[in-house]
Interface confidence: medium
């Protein structure tokens, strides 16, 4: 666990992330980073006539030498960076005011980095950090060199034979958001058939016409034949 306190006094603000670092998580999954703070001096007031100052919570991510503020919360209100609007949230705040636990949805490779939970209250400031490493890769697999020869059962076995498992739609979406592009329809774990397209062209439009995105044929009969998208935690 990573705990940092701003002073040696027992009555100082302290923040902790009770989770060993680094935390390794799989592509396409969600992540919860627990962050709790203890504020023995609460409430802090600026003057007798004013209301107590509420603690201010700030989550940020440090990666590739950049620090990005994900969200800021105070007085029960949470302001999320617009670039992360549907990506991050505080599931327990403000119901539990001292719980700054962060939830991150649909993890992509570039969500890797060091996450920082910082709490400010009056002149006090304390923080804790956790490194998150998003692992895994989605790859397209085709039997020999012939296109669309795998039924659903053989598709699953093909992935296993390649030290992988059949990918989930969430993993394919995450890979797409990381730049993966493939104009070949492939089975996924939920028995749907999809393919990720960044630059639509003739023959690759699918159900999204000329818009980029993951195309889907919906749920297919298990006897139909396509390629497959596999997911591996480690590529050798």
């Amino acid at each position: 666990a990573v705990t940092v306190e701003t002073s040696d006094h027992d009555n100082s603000l302290s923040v902790s992330i009770p989770q060993p670092s680094p935390l390794r998580v799989l592509l396409g999954t969600s992540l919860t980073i627990p962050c709790y703070f203890i504020d023995p001096m609460h409430p802090v007031t600026t003057a007798p006539s004013t209301a107590p100052l509420a603690p201010r919570i700030k989550w940020s991510r440090v990666s590739k030498e950049k620090e990005v503020v994900l969200l800021v919360a105070t007085e029960g209100r949470v302001r999320v960076n617009s670039a992360y609007q549907d990506k991050v949230s505080l599931p327990n705040y403000p119901a539990i005011p001292s719980d700054a636990t962060l939830e991150v949805q649909s993890l992509r490779s570039n969500d890797s980095g060091v996450y920082r939970c910082e709490v400010m209250h009056g002149i006090e400031d304390s923080e804790a950090t956790l490194e998150v490493v998003v692992k895994g890769i989605v790859f397209h697999y085709r039997a020999i060199s012939t296109r669309y020869t795998l039924d659903f059962d053989r598709a699953q076995r093909a992935c296993l034979q390649n030290s992988a498992i059949i990918a989930t739609p969430e993993q394919l979406q995450a890979a797409y958001e990381d730049g993966f592009h493939q104009c070949d329809a492939g089975w996924l774990a939920d028995q749907t058939v999809r393919y990720p397209i960044h630059t639509p062209r003739e023959g690759c439009y699918g159900d999204k016409d000329e818009f980029p995105g993951v195309r889907t044929y919906g749920i297919r009969d298990t006897n139909e034949t396509y390629d497959v998208y596999c997911f591996a935690e480690e590529m050798e």
Partner: nanobody, 124 residues
Amino acid sequence: EVQLVESGGGLVQAGGSLRLSCAASGRSFSSYAMGWFRQAPGKEREFVSIISWSGGSTVYADSVKGRFTISRDNAKNTVYLQMNSLKPEDTAIYYCAAGRLYRATPRPADFGSWGQGTQVTVSS
């Protein structure tokens, strides 16, 4: 806490290279973010570089970016600083530090353990 011992310093001509090593003893080296700082005579101790627990994330001071590379080997409990294209202004005592905190603008207070330092002198 961990104990840290730096090595690899010395006298080098401008444009030359050095590789500093910092060996850590004690428990759970991989649970510490590791940093390098330097202090020139009569100046404040300044941040050089930091590397995260796994080595997956690094930060460099603008003055060394593109010339210095930080790395770590958790199996050997060692952190390294490869210094290329050295300049006279890189002359300083280089300190290795271990801490629980990682941020884009590290400061000495973030680090609980420090080495004794190794002298690097760059002559013109």
